[in-house]
Structure formats: C-alpha cells, structure tokens
C-alpha cells in the first residue's frame, strides 16, 4: 500500500480466484483513543472499533472511503483504491490501446520542434468518474525537471455506437537545450483513476524521435510564362526551431489529381520552392520533415492548381 495523495491510498492487489488478498491496517488520524468506530462509504454498518482497523482487501468491494467516527462526529477519512495485477500484468482497462506505432501504445507524444515542449494524448471510452495526473522527467535515476500542465479533454469522437474521449497534456522541459544530443530519454507517467480503480501508464522517448513539424506555411503558386509549369513556394512553419540554417527541413511536393487513383507526382527538395506541372483539377501539396533525422513528416499543406 502506498499514498497517492493526502488520505488517498493505493493497494496493489495480485488478483486471481480465491486469492488471499492484501492485509491493510488503517489508522484513525486523531488523538482520541477510544469510542472510535469505522464505516465504509455511505453504509452505516460498523466494520470495527478502535483507533486502527485491519481489513483484508480481496476485491473492489473492499475498496472505498473508510471513515472513523466518534459519537456521531467524523474524525478522518482514508480512500482506498485498487491497482490490480492479473496473470502478472497490471490492468490497463481505463485507456484504449492506440496500437500505433505498436501494440500496447496507450500514450502518444509529439513535439513540433526541439524546444523541449511536447504534447501527449490518450484515448478512453469512459466518460465519468475519471481523473488523470501527469508527471515527467528526463531520465529516471537522477531525473531532470519537466513541467506538465493539467490533462484536459481535447476531443470527443463517435465510432459506430462507441464514444471515444481524447485527453491531452502539454509538458515543457525546464532546462531544454535544443541543439544538444539527447542521451537520456524523457519519461512520462500518467496516473489514471476511474471510480476505485487506479492504473498507471508510462512512455519513454527522445524528443528527436517524436518530432513532427507543423505543415509548411504560406504555400503559393506562380505560373511560369508559356508553360504548364508553376513555381510552388512556401515557408518554414512558425513553430519550427531556429536558426533554420541549423534546424533544417526537407520537403516533399506532391501533385495529386482529383481522383485518388490518378498517379501522384512527387518531388523531394531541401529548398523552399519547386517547379512542377500543374494538371487541371489537380492540387499541390507540400509537407516537411527534419532534414537530418527521419522522424515524422508533417501534415500536408495544399492549394488547388486552378
């Protein structure tokens, strides 16, 4: 058993049918010594008397808010949550497996640049009685500070008769050094509590591996005289790290016809312009990627040929 926050405790339970459970001793936070009784949640049934209460925690029915009283007055509360292990595996019931980039991916994180700022998000089908708390550090043995905000509901989606909720959090490394080679990974830890169920989820990554630039900005077409060719130009996104001479991007330019089945013409360039043939009803799209490290491509920025 360990304390999650004041008066809230997590009991780690290795559950299997007929498991003996965990013995837990609760102590009433009072100078009083006698006349103390204990109840659980809204029930008035007295579970025991005395300054301490010993319980055997075998299942969620044994979790909840234990209250000690004296003469009708509440003295203190202890909320017991369960963290359940089954077949040697901690439960992951609260969050949805996003299965990208691999199975058992519950947290996904991205950074728009090398500033040490990143966003993580996760999915759940649970709509009520749900709280999250996020902590982060660089390294785990001698951790360096990363500050995370509060997790917020960022999107709701309907998939069939499924409703899915996306939560996200923004974190910032306290002493980020954008140009430095990373040797210790960022660790992100999310505590999730649903009703009386506690679960924790972790992710470990280098900023360089989660980089996803914003799309190129200011995408423009300039027709070339007496030609079907156009000059496409764009700029680095505002959110990308500077100076651009050091934090360089490479670009992919794509000409796509109206029909998805039409052949796509693609050009790769390190410049911020390219010359392509603009077909009728086609569109031109450009996306960006770190020039020296193969992390994710940005989303496409697009303009119609016409």
């Amino acid at each position: 058993i360990w304390e999650l926050k004041k008066d809230v405790y997590v009991v780690e339970l290795d559950w299997y049918p007929d498991a003996p459970g965990e013995m837990v001793v609760l102590t009433c936070d009072t100078p009083e010594e006698d006349g103390i009784t204990w109840t659980l949640d809204q029930s008035s049934e007295v579970l025991g008397s005395g300054k301490t209460l010993t319980i055997q925690v075998k299942e969620f029915g044994d979790a909840g808010q234990y209250t000690c009283h004296k003469g009708g007055e509440v003295l203190s509360h202890s909320l017991l949550l369960l963290h359940k292990k089954e077949d040697g595996i901690w439960s992951t019931d609260i969050l949805k497996d996003q299965k990208e980039p691999k199975n058992k991916t519950f947290l996904r994180c991205e950074a728009k640049n090398y500033s040490g700022r990143f966003t993580c998000w996760w999915l759940t089908t649970i709509s009520t009685d749900l709280t999250f708390s996020v902590k982060s550090s660089r390294g785990s043995s001698d951790p360096q500070g990363v500050t995370c905000g509060a997790a917020t509901l960022s999107a709701e989606r309907v998939r069939g008769d499924n409703k899915e909720y996306e939560y996200s959090v923004e974190c910032q490394e306290d002493s980020a050094c954008p140009a430095a080679e990373e040797s210790l990974p960022i660790e992100v830890m999310v505590d999730a509590v649903h009703k009386l169920k506690y679960e924790n989820y972790t992710s470990s990554f280098f900023i360089r591996d989660i980089i996803k630039p914003d799309p190129p900005k200011n995408l423009q077409l300039k027709p070339l005289k007496n030609s079907r060719q156009v000059e496409v130009s764009w700029e680095y996104p505002d959110t990308w790290s500077t100076p651009h001479s050091y934090f360089s991007l490479t670009f992919c330019v794509q000409v796509q016809g109206k029909s998805k089945r039409e052949k796509k013409d693609r050009v790769f360039t390190d410049k911020t312009s390219a010359t392509v043939i603009c077909r009728k009803n086609a569109s031109i799209s450009v996306r960006a990627q770190d020039r020296y490290y193969s992390s994710s491509w940005s989303e496409w920025a697009s303009v119609p040929c016409s």
């Epitope: 299942e59 019931d93 089908t125 008769d161 009386l196 169920k197």
Partner: nanobody
C-alpha cells in the same frame, strides 16, 4: 449506457438445473464485466458471480462455488449462469448488472440492472 435483459428463470425441483441468460446491448464496451445477483423476498440483493467481457476471468460468491458456472458469448453479447444441484434456498429473483470494477461483490458498484428473472426451487 448498457441495457441488460435477463431470461431463463422458472420453476424447478430441488437437485435440478437452470441456465439463465443476460443479453447486453448498447455501450457494452464501457463496462468491464457483468455480474449476477439474487434477491430473495424481504432481503437485500446478494452477489452470486461475475465475469469479465474480455479475458473471461470469473469471480464467485462462496455460496455459488462448485454449483454455479458463469460464462459469456461475446458474439452474442450474452452472459450465462448455469445453475446445477439447485436448492430451495436458491429461490430468488436473479438480476444481472454491469460494472467497470472487476472483481466486485458490492451491488453499488453495478448499474444498468435488468428487470430480473424469477427462479423458484421446490422441494
């Protein structure tokens, strides 16, 4: 919200068997497990057994061990309670409920209760 409908109750002689069904519809994915409870006249609802939708782990009250078996058919979104060697004291209305807390024997942890199915065991 999950909707639950029980069926399969009836009158049976002591020593006989019954299989109860609990058909679930709606947001079944939002609950981890389904449990069976029973309520004899004038008494409170008492836990019998529960099963997870995924993984199939089952949890039984001491009074149900050895005689009752809970199972599920995910394709049919149905949970079954096979009751053997029935005794007169098994007479009750049997309810199923959904929970996101498995295992739990506490009725307040369950919701979306069905309307119940009557089981009567005669001696």
């Amino acid at each position: 919200e999950v909707q639950l409908v029980e069926s399969g109750g009836g009158l049976v002689q002591a020593g006989g068997s019954l299989r109860l069904s609990c058909a679930a519809s709606g947001r079944t994915f939002s609950s981890d497990a389904v449990g069976w409870f029973r309520q004899a006249p004038g008494l409170e609802r008492v836990f019998v057994a529960a099963i997870r939708w995924s993984g199939g782990s089952a949890y039984y009250a001491d009074s149900a061990k050895g005689r009752f078996t809970i199972s599920r058919d995910n394709a049919k979104n149905t949970v079954y309670l096979q009751m053997n060697s029935l005794k007169p004291e098994d007479t009750a209305v049997y309810y199923c409920g959904a929970t996101s807390l498995f295992p739990s024997s506490r009725g307040s942890h369950y919701d979306s209760w069905g309307q119940g199915t009557q089981v009567t065991v005669s001696s």
